[in-house]
């Protein structure tokens, strides 16, 4: 804070604004009858330098001239760009306890002369907008710099506006506030920008333009679409535009897409027919405008119109599969399953499925609609049955997909050979096979079907399946494949009226089981021991169990146990062993083995056979 300079004055030579690299002389003079009261000769004038209100230097050693007790001149050099404050203070040397007293101060600004403004660009937004120009000012001057924008045109048209740049604001754009009308379309206009500050001035090169060069139409507004006869693929896009617009660009895309469809429309007059839309799809539409076919600029894109195209009847065919089980002496339960259509086939919200089961010879027909993707019915075991399913939305139904209900595994000659299942990674399994050896009818297709080897509901947990063309002998299954779960996989070979299948188990990842089987009983029959067990709970199997091992040894023996390895079958829960001595107490236990290794042992049971040794 500088008080009004009561004690004296400070002056700068050559000026308080200097170019970068220049030196300046600062003189500090006391007014008459000011200074130290008793001894004027003890007056000492000092000069302090401040940058951003922080004292950075005492210029005591920079004195170049000194009238003792009256005035001092200091030379300052190497001033940095921007403003520096200098404060002159009076130090009365006989009274060292009093701080120096401020006399006066001065601000010196260091900067550069403005460069000629460049890259002038002018625009008028819309037919009723005003001309605004922007430019590149060049290097920062660090000084207050005034800019003048001048426009001249036909019929002695002149106009100018001013603004300034300093350390708080930047001036590189001005709106002239005048409107160029379309009747001046062919006329030429010239603009020039002049920059001036305390260190110099400069002018841009003249920039020439026409009405068409600078007028950018307003983006179209009030965009809407009308679907012809509620069509899902054809619609008329409509919008409002400025009167002089002759060219439009339309872009549209489904909302989840990454690439736009682009269309140019000449003399569209706010209307354009689109014919390639996808039904029941959320679209985004935008429009841009131009005033001239060859010259001029495109407007900004309009605000987006987001809308969904209407539905159309489903296309494509459903992928159907089924399961057949005999449920009493003359009835079977048919469970039909199908996969949902993908959106491009459904072309709307599927409201229901129409399901038909028909006995071909007797012409018995069962029909129903369901909203689920499965349907179950009990029908007679006799007769040749066929099923069909179609999907319906609000506009209609897809063509029905037919499938013959055959005994899927009934024909041994149609069973595929050498079926194998290999884990590819954490979530898929590669299934390969060879064609049936002696099929008496041609294989129309293969179906690879898989189910988890875990208890499940027939209707709640439908099968997963893939249709494979007859010349392919492999399938990569990944839908609903989880690690550490064993799947039963069937490869079906289907002809027109027969089916054959082969089964294999597979997993995508495996570990050794958590525990071994639990021995529930040991019984002796005809000099053989029967070991009975309960299977390992499914979550503890951790993959496909390949085999079980039954271990036994004499109770107090330290010898290695003997063992018997049996192929795992879920339907088997007992096994005979016949190499134990009578009246010797044995300890028995079981383990389970996956491709990753052997489980810890299950419970131990002691048993002492009574019968005669084998």
């Amino acid at each position: 804070n500088i008080d009004v300079c009561k004690l004296g004055t400070v002056t700068v030579q050559p000026a308080p604004v200097i170019p970068l690299g220049s030196a300046a002389n600062i003189s500090c003079s006391l007014n008459p009858k000011q200074g130290c009261s008793h001894y004027p000769s003890s007056n000492e004038l000092i000069l302090l330098k401040f940058v951003n209100d922080v004292l950075v230097e005492n210029l005591h050693g920079k004195k170049v001239h000194d009238h003792t007790g009256h005035s001092s001149t200091f030379q300052v050099t190497n001033l940095s760009l921007g403003m520096t404050l200098f404060v002159c203070k009076l130090n009365c040397s006989n009274s060292q306890k009093k701080p120096p007293v401020p006399v006066c101060g001065v601000e010196i600004s260091v900067g550069v002369a403005p460069e000629p403004p460049q890259n002038i660009s002018c625009v008028q937004e819309g037919e009723n907008g005003t001309v605004a120009c922007s430019w590149n000012s060049g290097k920062v001057t660090y000084l207050k710099t005034n800019y003048t924008l001048q426009l001249s045109g036909p019929n002695n048209l002149t106009c100018q506006k001013q603004c300034f740049s300093d350390n708080r604001q930047n001036c590189n754009r001005l709106d002239l506030g005048i409107n160029l009308s379309p009747d001046l379309a062919e006329s030429r206009f010239i603009v020039r920008v002049t920059a001036i500050n305390d260190l110099g001035n400069s002018s841009s090169l003249p920039h020439t333009f026409t009405f068409l060069d600078i007028v950018i139409p307003l983006p179209p507004w009030d965009i809407r679409i009308n679907f012809l006869n509620a069509s899902g693929s054809r619609g008329t896009l409509q919008w409002e535009d400025e009167g002089q617009v002759v060219l439009n660009q339309l872009r549209y895309q489904p909302l989840n897409s990454t690439s736009w469809n682009m269309v140019n429309a000449t003399n569209a007059k706010g209307k354009y027919d689109l014919r390639d839309l996808r039904p029941f799809t959320e679209y985004e539409f935008q429009i841009s405008s131009k005033l001239h076919l060859s010259g001029g600029s495109w407007s900004n894109w309009s605000e987006s119109l987001r809308t969904r195209t209407p539905e159309e009847e489903p296309v494509g065919i459903l992928d159907i599969w089924y399961m057949k089980q005999d449920i009493d002496y003359d009835r079977q339960q048919i469970s039909l399953f199908w996969k949902s259509l993908n959106p491009s086939e459904a072309r709307g919200k599927i409201l229901h499925y129409q399901v038909t089961l028909q006995e071909v010879t007797k012409k018995t027909t069962l029909q129903n609609t369901t909203r689920h993707t499965s349907w179950t019915r009990v029908i007679p075991r006799t007769g040749a049955w066929t099923a069909s399913v179609s999907a319906a939305n609000s506009k209609g139904a897809s063509a029905p997909t037919h499938i013959n209900i055959v005994d899927l595994c009934g024909t041994g000659l149609l069973a595929p050979h050498q079926v194998s299942a290999k884990s590819e990674n954490m979530d898929n399994i590669l299934v390969t096979w060879q064609p049936p050896k002696k099929a008496d009818s041609a294989v129309r297709e293969y179906i690879v079907e898989w189910r988890a080897l875990q208890p499940g509901s027939i209707t709640k947990f439908p099968p997963h399946w893939l249709r494979i063309p007859p010349d392919n002998m492999s399938a990569l299954i990944s839908e609903n494949i989880k690690p550490y779960i064993c799947y039963e996989i069937r490869v079906h070979a289907l002809s027109e009226s027969q089916g054959g299948c082969s089964s294999i188990r597979g997993d995508s990842k495996h570990k050794a089981p958590v525990s071994g089987p639990h021995i529930t009983a040991i019984t002796e029959k005809k000099e053989r021991l029967f070991i009975s067990w309960t299977h390992i709970p499914f979550p503890e199997q951790r993959g496909c169990i390949l085999h079980y091992r039954i271990y036994w040894k004499e109770r107090d023996s330290t010898a290695q146990p003997e063992l018997c390895e049996i192929q795992y079958r879920r339907s088997q829960n007992s096994h005979p062993i016949s190499s134990l001595q009578p009246r010797v107490t044995y300890v028995l236990w079981m383990t389970a083995v996956t491709a990753a290794g052997e489980s810890p042992q299950g419970n131990e049971r002691e048993f002492c056979p009574q019968g005669k040794a084998n």
Epitope: Q325, T370, H372, S374, W375, T376, R451, A452, L453, Q454, P455, G456, S457, I458, T459, K460, F461, Y487, E488, R490, S503, R505, R570, S571
Partner: nanobody, 119 residues
Amino acid sequence: QVQLQESGGGLVQAGGSLRLFCTASGSIFAIDDMYWYRQAPGKQREFVAYITATNSANYLDSVNGRFTISRDNAKNSVYLQMNSLKPEDTAVYYCNAKQIVGFQIDEYWGQGTQVTVSS
């Protein structure tokens, strides 16, 4: 394992009604498909009705319109409401549950409850 227990059978006059009950216990987490069967003296056991997880039901032709199968998942129970009973409906009625493991169907049966319809 799954245990099924039927009740509600008895002697009823032709044209009368009975309600059979079946309660499931044990490892029932995967039992969604429930059935009623019956076996008349000297005849084979036959399917009567079933109900799926999605409450879709299906019936033997001769009982369709007279019998209604329903379920109460909270109570792990399945019911068979039998109206307009006929003498030929006389049989032991069995509750049945089916679940699938891989492609093998496991079945569980109750002990049965006797229904006698007198003329």
